[in-house]
C-alpha cells in the first residue's frame, strides 16, 4: 500500500489530499475509508468512482439534511452501513471490473479532505506443473493478476512465455530441461500477491505423473 | 517480417484424411502459440485450437477435438493440422494464426487454405 | 464459455455517414478486440485493449465499452470499410478464443 499526502492551500479552502494503492482479492469484500473526521465537523461527503471504460460515478451524503444520492447503480457499490454512521464505502464481492480509482471528498467549514485510493484486484493464479519430455519439466501460473514469477530449484535451461487475457489476467508458462543426470527432482516455485507455491516433480526417463495446486 | 504461409487450396473426398501446413518465417518459431481458425463460407469464425512450437502443448476447442490434430516440425518452422473423416461440413478456409505476449488475441495471419471436400 | 453477440448482422451505411455496431459478452470483460475482414482475405487486427486502433487502422474508427458491452465507431463512413467486423475474446481459464458472430458492413 503507498501512501502520498498533500496539502495544499488555497485562499478559499485548504485541502489535505491522501493517495493510497489497496489490492484486493477477486470475490472478496473491499471497504474503503474516508478522512477520520467527525460527522458533525462533515457539510458533504462524496465518494467519486472511476471505472476502466465507464463514466465516472458519484455517491454522496448531505450532512445537514441527511441526504443521500447516488449514479452508481448497478455496480455493486454502496455505503458500507447508513453514511451518518460511517462513510466507508463497501464492495460487496470485488470483480476484476471494480478496478479503478475511488475518490472520498469530505467537505468541512476547515476545509476539503480528500482520500484517493487507486483499487487494484488480484486473482490467485492457477499452478500446474508436469513433466513434458525427458528432462524437461513444465510449470504453469494460469490466469493470474498480475502476473506470477516462476522460478526453478535447482536452475535449468529455461524459457518463460507470458500470455495477456481480454479479463485482464495473464497465464506463465516456464519450460525448462535439466541436461545433468545427477538432478533427479525438481521444484518450481510461483510467486504471486496472493501467496507463493511451490510444487516438486522427480524427473523420470519417460513422461510422468502431472502434479497440480491452485 | 512476420509472415505465415499457407497453400491456397486443397481437394479432398469424403472420408479421407487432410494434413495442411503452415510455415512461419521473421521471428522466433517457439516462442509465440499457433492456432488455427475456421471459417466456412459465408459464415462466422471459429477457433479450433493452438499448439506451442516448443514443446508440443496442445488445446483444443472441444467441438474439434475429435476432428483435428495439431503438430510442429520445429526444424522448418512450420506447423501442421490434420483433419480427420472430411465431410461436406468440413469444406472450409482454414487459416493459421500467431498468438502469445501482450495481446490477448491474433495479431498475424495466414492467407487461408480452401479445402473442399467433393467426390 | 463467454459468447459474444455482435448487433446489427449486416448494416449500410451512406458514405460519410457514422456507423456503430455492438458486441455483447455473456461474462464481464476487461478488453475487446476488433477484427476486420475484407471478402476473401484473411482478418486484419484492427482495435485492440478495446479502444487502441491497430497500425494502420484510419483515425476514424474507435472502440469503446466496458464489462459486457462494448461497440466499434466509424465517425465518417468510407467505401473502403466495406467488410465484416468481428469482436474477439480470449479466456485463460478455461482456455478459449471467442469470436462474435460479425457485423457485415456494406455501402449504400
Known amino acids: 500500500t503507498d501512501k502520498n499526502q498533500t496539502t495544499q492551500n488555497n485562499s478559499s479552502s485548504p485541502l489535505t489530499q491522501v493517495n493510497t494503492t489497496v489490492s484486493v482479492q477477486i470475490g472478496t469484500k473491499a471497504l474503503l475509508c474516508c478522512f477520520s473526521i467527525p460527522l458533525t465537523k462533515a457539510v458533504l461527503i462524496t465518494w467519486i468512482i472511476k471505472l476502466r471504460g465507464l463514466p465516472s460515478c458519484t455517491i454522496a451524503y448531505k450532512v445537514d439534511t441527511k441526504t443521500n444520492e447516488t449514479s452508481c447503480l448497478g455496480r455493486n457499490i454502496t455505503w458500507a452501513s447508513t453514511p451518518d454512521h460511517s462513510p466507508e464505502l463497501q464492495i460487496s464481492a470485488v470483480t476484476l471490473q471494480h478496478e479503478g480509482t475511488y475518490t472520498c471528498e469530505t467537505v468541512t467549514p476547515e476545509g476539503n479532505f480528500e482520500k484517493n485510493y487507486d483499487l487494484q484486484v488480484l486473482v490467485t493464479p492457477e499452478v500446474t506443473l508436469f513433466q513434458n519430455r525427458n528432462r524437461t519439466a513444465v510449470c504453469k501460473a494460469v490466469a493470474g493478476k498480475p502476473a506470477a514469477h516462476i522460478s526453478w530449484i535447482p536452475e535449468g535451461d529455461c524459457a518463460t512465455k507470458q500470455e495477456y487475457w481480454s479479463n485482464g489476467t495473464v497465464t506463465v508458462k516456464s519450460t525448462c530441461h535439466w541436461e545433468v543426470h545427477n538432478v533427479s527432482t525438481v521444484t518450481c516455485h510461483v510467486s504471486h500477491l496472493t501467496g507463493n507455491k511451490s510444487l516438486y516433480i522427480e524427473l523420470l526417463p519417460v513422461p510422468g505423473a502431472k502434479k497440480s495446486a491452485k | 517480417q512476420v509472415q505465415l504461409q499457407q497453400p491456397g487450396a486443397e481437394l479432398v473426398k469424403p472420408g479421407a484424411p487432410v494434413k495442411l501446413s503452415c510455415k512461419a518465417s521473421g521471428y522466433t518459431f517457439t516462442s509465440y502459440w499457433m492456432n488455427w481458425v475456421k471459417q466456412r463460407p459465408g459464415r462466422g469464425l471459429e477457433w479450433i485450437g493452438r499448439?506451442?512450437?516448443?514443446?508440443?502443448?496442445?488445446h483444443y476447442n472441444q467441438k474439434f477435438k475429435d476432428k483435428a490434430t495439431l503438430t510442429v516440425d520445429k526444424s522448418s518452422s512450420t506447423a501442421y493440422i490434420q483433419l480427420s473423416s472430411l465431410t461436406s461440413e468440413d469444406s472450409a478456409v482454414y487459416y493459421c494464426a500467431r498468438s502469445g505476449g501482450w495481446l490477448p488475441g491474433f495479431a498475424y495471419w495466414g492467407q487461408g487454405t480452401l479445402v473442399t471436400v467433393s467426390a | 464459455e463467454n459468447v459474444l453477440t455482435q448487433s446489427p448482422a449486416i448494416m449500410s451505411a451512406s458514405p460519410g455517414e457514422k456507423v456503430t455496431m455492438t458486441c455483447s459478452a455473456s461474462s464481464s470483460l476487461s478488453y475487446m478486440l476488433w477484427y476486420q475482414q475484407k471478402s476473401s482475405t484473411s482478418p486484419k487486427l484492427w482495435i485492440y485493449d478495446t479502444s487502441k486502433l491497430a497500425s494502420g487502422v484510419p483515425g476514424r474508427f474507435s472502440g469503446s465499452g466496458s464489462g459486457n458491452s462494448y461497440s466499434l465507431t466509424i465517425s465518417s463512413m468510407e467505401a473502403e470499410d466495406v467488410g465484416t467486423y468481428y469482436c474477439?475474446?480470449?479466456?485463460?481459464?478455461?482456455?478459449?478464443?471467442?469470436f462474435g458472430g460479425g457485423t457485415k458492413l456494406e455501402i449504400k
Open positions: 499448439i506451442d512450437p516448443s514443446d508440443s502443448e496442445t
Open positions: 474477439f475474446q480470449g479466456s485463460g481459464n478455461p482456455l478459449m478464443y471467442t
